[in-house]
């Protein structure tokens, strides 16, 4: 399906609006420090060029690849060396090495200022003054902070962002209308970014096979009535889409995602009964809806798995003929029967099955050797079940904030070398598993909890990879994608860690804490808690609780005082002294 001009092909397929938006996202994800105006200029130049190619596909340079065109454009940025340092060296390379180089320089934690939300009237004015610039700025700010954000999904977020402003800026109470919508978009956006980051990590660190295995399991749970061949086709197409997006090929990715949504909707009778509503929506909503669609009902009277995968005398023959196809069928059959299992558990079971066949099919009596393979699954299933049960009980007992604190302590003791901001961010997100998943019935708890934890632990892995400080983190992150969570769960207190020197400045607080939002105040307190554990890794729960209770009382007292700053200075010194005494520092 070769086109004379790839850029003309994508421009025609996507339309000018989506083309411009996707090019802006691509550029902002590569050059995360560049000012908005510079990116807009580059995008406009690329768009004008694309239009000349649409008019005449044989025109000069129209036959060049998108990577060549986009890379050449990015390399025209005057301040590349000053702003990005060694990333400028990418420009000396030829494609495809140049694009790979740009990809390697994507920064998961760019040094960018926090996005501050202006007053509602100010936002509405900006929206009304220039809607197009306002929405482009949204794409730019999200893309540069989340360099792996799933681009076609970001278009969907931008559409909702526009709708929120269109609706709320004409509402009687603009703030009451707009702020909850913006909060929802922010939270969903962070979740979407993290989920996509795991997909990209899976592809880039563990390869296409790992991603395909994940996709087989997830799609089989979602579409249990679909035939294996149908699921396999969807997996192949979905893998192509995500490979493209993770590789920076955003135009191809968006185009192929639209084709996949079209195919799914044209073939919904052989895929799932739950797709009807999704397929009536416009493109962006349709693709989002399909990605989030609930699991279809399992077909009635599915036969036992043992017949084909344990009892059959042809197991080794079938396995030898086409190993990945046979394992894929096993995963498909197991997953469609178990919507109550997490995807990572299903992948662990498939790995155990594969290991058993590798061993047993070379044995004297293969059947005798693998006859009890399903018994090996029992402990693998029980481990996450028990862990979730225990943690949900703890969550229900403590509430989200204190549950997060328990996890902060737990993870700081496991990997104290990790930076405090990372430990706070990751532990807070781990703690959110409680309110997200513990409310579900038993049958939905594990897929909710363990697959969410995989996403959060991947955040830890990608942040740690940027500046590695802990061999234990590196080990858990790189050895096995599906065993990351069990690996972290199994970590005990790091006995090799030398406690951090005590620094009173770390525990010095000022009156500005009083004006912070509840969330920001929690983060301050949780930051202090991590630092406490780093100073005193052997502190007991009781000791830490006492210090944290004193700290909360101190903040409350000083925030009520007439002279807040003096209170923080004087009472703060007393608190530090008392805490040192309590912890034996």
């Amino acid at each position: 399906d070769a086109h004379k001009s790839e850029v003309a092909h994508r421009f025609k397929d996507l339309g000018e609006e989506n083309f411009k938006a996707l090019v802006l996202i691509a550029f902002a994800q590569y050059l995360q420090q560049c000012p908005f105006e510079d990116h807009v200029k580059l995008v406009n130049e690329v768009t004008e060029f694309a239009k000349t190619c649409v008019a005449d596909e044989s025109a000069e340079n129209c036959d060049k690849s998108l990577h060549t065109l986009f890379g050449d454009k990015l390399c025209t940025v005057a301040t590349l060396r000053e702003t990005y340092g060694e990333m400028a060296d990418c420009c000396a390379k030829q494609e495809p090495e140049r694009n790979e180089c740009f990809l390697q320089h994507k920064d998961d934690n760019p040094n960018l200022p926090r996005l501050v939300r202006p007053e509602v009237d100010v936002m509405c004015t900006a929206f009304h003054d220039n809607e197009e610039t306002f929405l482009k700025k949204y794409l730019y700010e999200i893309a540069r902070r989340h360099p792996y954000f799933y681009a076609p999904e970001l278009l969907f977020f931008a559409k909702r962002y526009k709708a929120a402003f269109t609706e709320c800026c004409q509402a009687a109470d603009k703030a009451a209308c707009l702020l909850p919508k913006l909060d929802e978009l922010r939270d969903e956006g962070k979740a979407s970014s993290a989920k996509q980051r795991l997909k990209c990590a899976s592809l880039q660190k563990f390869g296409e096979r790992a991603f395909k295995a994940w996709a087989v399991a997830r799609l089989s749970q979602r579409f249990p009535k679909a035939e294996f061949a149908e699921v396999s086709k969807l997996v192949t197409d979905l893998t192509k889409v995500h490979t493209e997006c993770c590789h920076g090929d955003l135009l191809e990715c968006a185009d192929d995602r639209a084709d996949l949504a079209k195919y799914i909707c044209e073939n919904q009778d052989s895929i799932s009964s739950k797709l009807k509503e999704c397929c009536e929506k416009p493109l962006l909503e349709k693709s989002h809806c399909i990605a989030e669609v609930e699991n279809d009902e399992m077909p009635a009277d599915l036969p036992s798995l043992a017949a084909d995968f344990v009892e059959s005398k042809d197991v080794c023959k079938n396995y030898a003929e086409a190993k990945d196809v046979f394992l894929g069928m096993f995963l498909y059959e197991y997953a469609r029967r178990h919507p109550d299992y997490s995807v990572v558990l299903l992948l662990r079971l498939a790995k155990t099955y594969e290991t058993t066949l590798e061993k047993c099919c070379a044995a004297a009596d293969p059947h005798e050797c693998y006859a009890k393979v399903f018994d090996e699954f029992k402990p693998l299933v029980e481990e996450p079940q028990n862990l979730i049960k225990q943690n949900c009980e703890l969550f229900e007992q403590l509430g989200e904030y204190k549950f997060q604190n328990a996890l902060l302590v737990r993870y700081t003791k496991k990997v104290p070398q990790v930076s405090t901001p990372t430990l706070v961010e990751v532990s807070r997100n781990l703690g959110k598993v409680g309110s997200k998943c513990c409310k579900h019935p038993e049958a939905k708890r594990m897929p909710c909890a363990e697959d969410y934890l995989s996403v959060v632990l991947n955040q830890l892995c990608v942040l740690h990879e940027k500046t590695p400080v802990s061999d234990r983190v590196t080990k858990c992150c790189t050895e096995s994608l599906v065993n990351r969570r069990p690996c972290f769960s199994a970590l005990e207190v790091d006995e090799t860690y030398v406690p951090k020197e005590f620094n009173a400045e770390t525990f010095t607080f000022h009156a500005d804490i009083c004006t912070l939002s509840e969330k920001e105040r929690q983060i301050k307190k949780q930051t202090a808690l991590v630092e406490l554990v780093k100073h005193k890794p052997k502190a007991t729960k009781e000791q830490l609780k006492a210090v944290m209770d004193d700290f909360a009382a101190f903040v409350e007292k000083c925030c009520k005082a007439d002279d807040k700053e003096t209170c923080f200075a004087e009472e703060g010194k007393k608190l530090v002294a008392a805490s040192q005494a309590a912890l034996g520092l």
Partner: antibody, heavy 124, light 108 residues
Framework: EVQLLQSGAEVKEPGASVKVSCKAS????????ISWVRQAPGQGLEWVGR????????GYAQRLQGRVTMTTDTSTSIAYMEVRSLRSDDTAVYYC?????????????????WGQGTMVTVSS | DIVLTQSPSSLSASVGDRVTITCRAS??????LNWYQQKPGKAPKLLIY???SLQSGVPSRFSGSGSGTDFTLTISSLQPEDFATYYC??????????FGQGTKLEIK
């Protein structure tokens, strides 16, 4: 050119209902709210209510609550205001007006474009 | 509800005069105040929004000022076409958006 064109004058008996229409043109209808204002003969302006043309949310003046309903048809860019159980003191010129956009960092909800008005007479 | 009181209720002035109309709110409304002009038999027309911003197309002889509870509309040099009734309107509180009772400006 931004315009609001209202339906013609109506004469109604007490207890009846009246439905006034307001056809918008020259702008994206669902991006601007619509307010309704009335003016009794020789009197000042009285705010009747408003409708969010994007989601259909409404807000009405207390004294008309329960008797007035505002709706829109986005496919035709028309706003409607219906008043039921008409009384003689509902006799007035009814205006539709567009709620202006936020400017210079403030959303003053100024009524920047007005219809020509519809005279509603309630008389037995 | 927020009550707006305009003063004077009516006034007579001559072409070329400087005229000031005031509008007082029963509670602070920040800058959420608009001014309209209405001529007999016609729909009102927006002059000033957000207390002091001139609506496009409105002559610069019209100006608005004030914030909180006290606001003024000033016509720096009265023209023949300016004889009309002027209304202030607040949009601070969520509905109802109240109007002042109006100020009738007549030729002396």
């Amino acid at each position: 050119e931004v315009q609001l064109l209202q339906s013609g004058a109506e004469v109604k008996e007490p207890g009846a209902s009246v439905k006034v229409s307001c056809k918008a043109s020259g702008y994206t209808f669902s991006s601007y709210g619509i307010s309704w204002v009335r003016q009794a003969p020789g009197q000042g302006l009285e705010w009747v209510g408003r409708i969010n043309t994007y989601n259909g949310n409404t807000g009405y003046a207390q004294r008309l609550q329960g008797r007035v309903t505002m709706t829109t048809d986005t496919s035709t860019s028309i706003a409607y205001m219906e008043v039921r159980s008409l009384r003689s003191d509902d006799t007035a010129v009814y205006y539709c007006a567009r709620l202006g956009h936020c400017q210079r960092g403030i959303c003053s909800d100024a009524l920047d474009t007005w219809g020509q008005g519809t005279m509603v007479t309630v008389s037995s | 509800d927020i009550v707006l009181t305009q003063s004077p209720s009516s006034l007579s002035a001559s072409v070329g005069d400087r005229v000031t109309i005031t509008c007082r709110a029963s509670q602070s409304i920040s800058s959420y105040l608009n001014w309209y002009q209405q001529k007999p038999g016609k729909a009102p027309k927006l002059l000033i929004y957000a207390a002091s911003s001139l609506q496009s197309g409105v002559p610069s002889r019209f100006s608005g000022s004030g914030s909180g509870t006290d606001f003024t509309l000033t016509i720096s040099s009265l023209q023949p076409e300016d004889f009309a009734t002027y209304y202030c309107q607040q949009s601070y509180s969520t509905p109802p958006y109240t109007f002042g009772q109006g100020t009738k400006l007549e030729i002396k």
